[in-house]
Every structure is written in structure tokens, then in C-alpha cells.
């Protein structure tokens, strides 16, 4: 799978994580920090 950094317009897309652009899948993906989940890493769990 080809990946690259997200475009600058997606700054802030991932609330608590790193935004990765999955080129072949035509979508952005959030790699969440430890303790966070959700499509955009918006949910905190213990």
C-alpha cells in the first residue's frame, strides 16, 4: 500500500494522532496516539 503524509488541508483532521494518506485507497487514515480511538482519534479510553 502506497502511503504519504496528508495534504495541508487535513491539518487538524486527526484530533489525537497522525494523519496518513493511503494513496491506493484514496483516503486519509488517522494513526491514533495511545489511549485514543475512533476514525479521527476523537475518543479517549482508559
Amino acid at each position: 500500500v502506497s502511503i504519504t503524509k496528508c495534504n495541508s488541508d487535513m491539518n487538524g483532521y486527526c484530533l489525537h494522532g497522525q494523519c496518513i494518506y493511503l494513496v491506493d485507497m484514496s483516503q486519509n487514515y488517522c494513526r491514533c496516539e495511545v489511549g485514543y480511538t475512533g476514525v479521527r482519534c476523537e475518543h479517549f479510553y482508559l
Partner: antibody
Amino acid sequence: QDQLVQSGAEVKKPGASVKVSCKASGFNIKDTYIQWVRQAPGQGLEWMGRIDPLRGNTKYRERFEGRVTITADTSTNTAYMELSSLRSEDTAVYYCVRSGTLFDFWGQGTLVTVSS
Amino acid sequence: DIQMTQSPSSLSASVGDRVTITCKASQDIHKYIAWYQQKPGQAPRLLIQYTSTLQPGVPSRFSGSGSGTDYTFTISSLQPEDIATYYCLQYDNLRTFGGGTKVEIK
């Protein structure tokens, strides 16, 4: 099946406002950005602005600032684009477009006609 | 706002010809360019994103290349069904469409 279903065609008088809705199904708009694009008859595509429904943040093309308002109601999974002070040049098909989780998934378009 | 200058605005070519459309950005867009095909009365159809990545179901005669500010879209062998208007879109910093290229058959 993911869908963006837009409201029906509108006819407005110059100076009036129009509010176009874009209802999402099959996905949560909070996971995406919703963009708005328009196309006047026989003309090219023009990006108007976008909203991040999760945060409520909006960005607008400079020439529409102050005349366009993009909002989202996450409880109904619907985005809206309101354009005020309409003039004949605003006659166009208006599209909502999902981006973020999937690159550019388009609604069917809404024709807005501005005529006296 | 980033400006996208698309050329030519229209072209006429024969079936089987190689067709090339260019888009120049007013600043580096880091390969974040997409190409759309639009036929009359239809919504735009995404052909290519991230400069050269073909969407599923799009024929391999369509291709894209470029980097920095200069990008190219190519139809290697024009077919009658390719008659349409083509648009580039930069999506690095917000969004800007090129002015479009109307492709006709000679």
C-alpha cells in the same frame, strides 16, 4: 451504500437567500469534511468552501466570504450551504462533496435558479 | 488561494490520437492533484488522484504525471466515449479547480 442526497431545485429572486441541504447515509459526517462546489450553466467547477462537522470549523473561498455560510447538524447527519444576496450569476448546480475518509464522493447536485 | 492554470481550454483530436492537458499551480501542491471527466448533464467523475493514481474501473489509457507546480494528464489513444470536459483539481491547500478542457473529436 454510502449516499449524499441533496435537496430539490430552487427558484429564487435576486437579493434573496437559498439554503441547500445535503443528507448523508451509510457514513457519519463527523468522520469527514463536507465540501461545496458549484457549476454555472456552461461554466467550469468552482469550489466554495467546506466544513469539518466534528469541530464545526469552516473555510470559504475568499470571494464568497460574508455571503456563504456552511453548517452541519451531526444529529441528523446533514450539511447545509446557505448563500445570501443572490444575483443572476449565482444560477448554478450546487454539489456537496465528501472528503477525508474517501476521496471526493459527490451528491447529485441541486439546481438553484435566480430570476426576477 | 492557489491558482490553477489549465491549458488548452479546448482541443480537437482524431480517434486514436494522444491527448495531453496541462495544469500549472501558482505554488508547489506536493502532487495533490486530481483529474475529473465531466459529460453534459452529469456530475464530474474522478479519474485520477494524487497525480497518477487511477481510480478503480478507469481505463488504463488515462494517466497523470508531474510534481511541484507542473502536472500533465494524458489520454494515450482517444476514444469516442472520451468526449467530455476535463478538470484538474488541487487539494493540497483547500481546493481550486482548473478552468477545464473541452475535448472534441475531429
